[in-house]
Every structure is written in structure tokens, then in C-alpha cells.
């Protein structure tokens, strides 16, 4: 498959398990892959009684489920871990839960960056 219109070169990166896995906790991830493959951004999170717990964000390999999605929208009804993917730089900064079966749309905005 060729590259999509919204070519993904960079994604927001996050790893809640960064200490155990000895990675950065957050930042940017540059997406690099094979010439004929598309790349995407993704986000995964938990929702415990309305409290959002971010799990992972980053680049995601060529996945037909993510094609031509400009926004990161999870559609599963009530999973243990929510997942969304999208195309376009930093498209995983915000993420949304919009169940296919209908129901309220919930959008999660990233917290404002603390002044340095």
C-alpha cells in the first residue's frame, strides 16, 4: 500500500511504564518505516470511573484500521484498554471515545504544558 495523503512523520510519545521499561516517559517519536508502508500514530488509555489513565502513545505500523483517519477515535464500547489510531503528524495528541453503538462522545485534551 502506498502512503496516505496525511503522511505520518512524527507522533506524540508516551509510556506509562517508562521506569520499568527504561524508556522516556513522554516526548515525540519520529516514525520511520519501509518505503511502501504507511505509518500511523496511536494512543491507548484506561478509563477508571471517569478518570483517564494514559498507557501508551507513539508510532504504529501500517494498519488498514487506521487508514484515512485524521482523528484518534476509539470505537469499542467498553474495553479494558481503549485504543485509537490515526494518520497525520501528532494526530494522537487528542483522543476520543465514540462508541459505534452510540453514546456520548468523550474527547480527552492533553494537559496544558507547564511554563518553564
Amino acid at each position: 500500500s502506498g502512503r496516505g495523503e496525511a503522511e505520518t512523520r512524527e507522533c506524540i510519545y508516551y509510556n506509562a511504564n517508562w521506569e520499568l521499561e527504561r524508556t522516556n516517559q513522554s516526548g515525540l517519536e519520529r516514525c520511520e518505516g519501509e518505503q511502501d508502508k504507511r505509518l500511523h500514530c496511536y494512543a491507548s488509555w484506561r478509563n477508571s470511573s471517569g478518570t483517564i489513565e494514559l498507557v501508551k502513545k507513539g508510532c504504529w505500523l501500517d494498519d488498514f484500521n487506521c487508514y484515512d483517519r485524521q482523528e484518534c477515535v476509539a470505537t469499542e464500547e467498553n474495553p479494558q484498554v481503549y485504543f485509537c489510531c490515526c494518520e497525520g503528524n501528532f494526530c494522537n495528541e487528542r483522543f476520543t471515545h465514540l462508541p459505534e453503538a452510540g453514546g456520548p462522545e468523550v474527547t480527552y485534551e492533553p494537559p496544558p504544558t507547564a511554563p518553564t
Epitope: 511504564n17 517519536e29 507513539g58 488498514f64 479494558q80
Partner: antibody, heavy 120, light 107 residues
Framework: EVQLLESGGGLVQPGGSLRLSCAAS????????MGWVRQAPGKGLEWVSS????????YYADSVKGRFTISRDNSKNTLYLQMNSLRAEDTAVYYC?????????????WGQGTLVTVSS | DIQMTQSPSSLSASVGDRVTITCRAS??????LNWYQQKPGKAPKLLIY???NLQSGVPSRFSGSGSGTDFTLTISSLQPEDFATYYC?????????FGGGTKVEIK
């Protein structure tokens, strides 16, 4: 052609050491995470260890932690597995495998495997 | 560690049959789930990654589905070259784990 070629397997006594090597060719080695997966005779696949693109992050199965060390030399396009304090239960075919740097990190290319036999 | 359980551990089928193999994770692995095929004396081969994406060069009779804890590998019409052992693997945790395998034998 993308290729991984393991070497270094053989017969070793319990408590002994062995170093496996995996020579990579046909792709940008430093752009991929790498791993070792083993298979005991007649058994299933067991993930052993993985290493990040730069070598800065390493991961081990509980069964080998503290005894095995994974490393890589990007200038030589080579992956290593140093195995110390070997036990009979470490007897297996050891495969090296390539893993894209991005999630969900599948093992997309595998070597042919090298047999490690731990026996007195 | 995340445990991966495959069922059945073995099955007998005929050429042309539709075959379904299931894989269950002890906790959610989201879509961080890959499937491999292994023939005797050979290295494993990646079939499906990210739960449902066909790896390049793999025939379209193979398909994957599922997310969270329950996943399925389906072979729509079994071919002679498909008799092999199939493994699922989670990569949600940095400590990867494989399922125990499902051996597909000729009936």
C-alpha cells in the same frame, strides 16, 4: 536479500557459558529492535530477550534474567546473546529475530536457528 | 507477566476446511497481538500483526480478529501447505509472551 544468520551454538556442560551471534544483512540493522526466541525440543516458542535499536534498553524473560545478556554492535550489524550458568532446561534451538522499532513490534524476520545443548 | 492461552492445542482438518484458532490473554493487550506459523524444522513466519493486519506475502485466506483479551486466527480454506503449528504472541508488555501453540494436522 534480508537475512539473519545465527552461530555459536553447540554442546556445553551445565554451569558453562556460550555466546551466540546473529549476523544481519540486507536491511538497516540499526533501525530495528532485535530479539532472541528459543524452542526446546518438541516444545513451543519462548521469548528470551529483546534489545532496542540503540542497545540502550534490554528486556529478559524471568527464566534467563541474571544469566543471559543481550547486546548488539550496530557497526558490525551483529546481535549477541551471552549465556552464562547454563542449565539443562536451556537446551533449545535459539532464533534471532528482527522487530520494527514501532508498535506493535512483531518479529517480522527470523534466522534459521542455532541449537544449544546443555548436557554433561 | 501476561499469559497467553491458545485453544485448541491441536486439531485435525481437511483441505478446504475453514479453521479457527483462538488466543486469550490474561489481561488486555489491546491490539498488540501477532500470529506466527511454524513448520517442522523451520523458523517461525509472521502471518498477522496488530491483531488483524496481513503481513506482506501472506495469502489472503489467513485473517485475524479481536482486541483486548480475545483473538482469533482464521484460515478460510485450508491448503496442504497450511498444515503447521500456529502461535499467538503479545507485544503489549515489553516482556513478550507466546501462546502454547496450535498444531493443525491432516484429518
Amino acid at each position: 536479500e534480508v537475512q539473519l544468520l545465527e552461530s555459536g551454538g553447540g554442546l556445553v556442560q551445565p554451569g558453562g557459558s556460550l555466546r551466540l551471534s546473529c549476523a544481519a544483512s540486507g536491511f538497516a540493522f540499526s533501525s530495528y529492535a532485535m530479539g532472541w526466541v528459543r524452542q526446546a525440543p518438541g516444545k513451543g516458542l519462548e521469548w528470551v530477550s529483546s534489545i532496542s535499536t540503540s542497545g540502550g534498553s534490554t528486556y529478559y524473560a524471568d527464566s534467563v534474567k541474571g544469566r543471559f545478556t543481550i547486546s548488539r554492535d550496530n557497526s558490525k550489524n551483529t546481535l549477541y546473546l551471552q549465556m552464562n550458568s547454563l542449565r539443562a532446561e536451556d537446551t533449545a534451538v535459539y532464533y534471532c529475530a528482527r522487530s520494527p522499532a514501532h508498535s506493535p513490534h512483531p518479529f517480522d524476520i527470523w534466522g534459521q536457528g542455532t541449537l544449544v545443548t546443555v548436557s554433561s | 507477566d501476561i499469559q497467553m492461552t491458545q485453544s485448541p492445542s491441536s486439531l485435525s482438518a481437511s483441505v478446504g476446511d475453514r479453521v479457527t484458532i483462538t488466543c486469550r490473554a490474561s489481561q488486555s493487550v489491546s491490539r498488540f497481538l501477532n500470529w506466527y506459523q511454524q513448520k517442522p524444522g523451520k523458523a517461525p513466519k509472521l502471518l498477522i500483526y496488530a491483531a488483524s493486519n496481513l503481513q506482506s506475502g501472506v495469502p489472503s485466506r489467513f485473517s485475524g480478529s479481536g482486541s483486548g483479551t480475545d483473538f482469533t486466527l482464521t484460515i478460510s480454506s485450508l491448503q496442504p501447505e497450511d498444515f503447521a503449528t500456529y502461535y499467538c504472541q503479545q507485544s503489549y508488555s515489553s516482556l513478550f509472551t507466546f501462546g502454547g501453540g496450535t498444531k493443525v494436522e491432516i484429518k
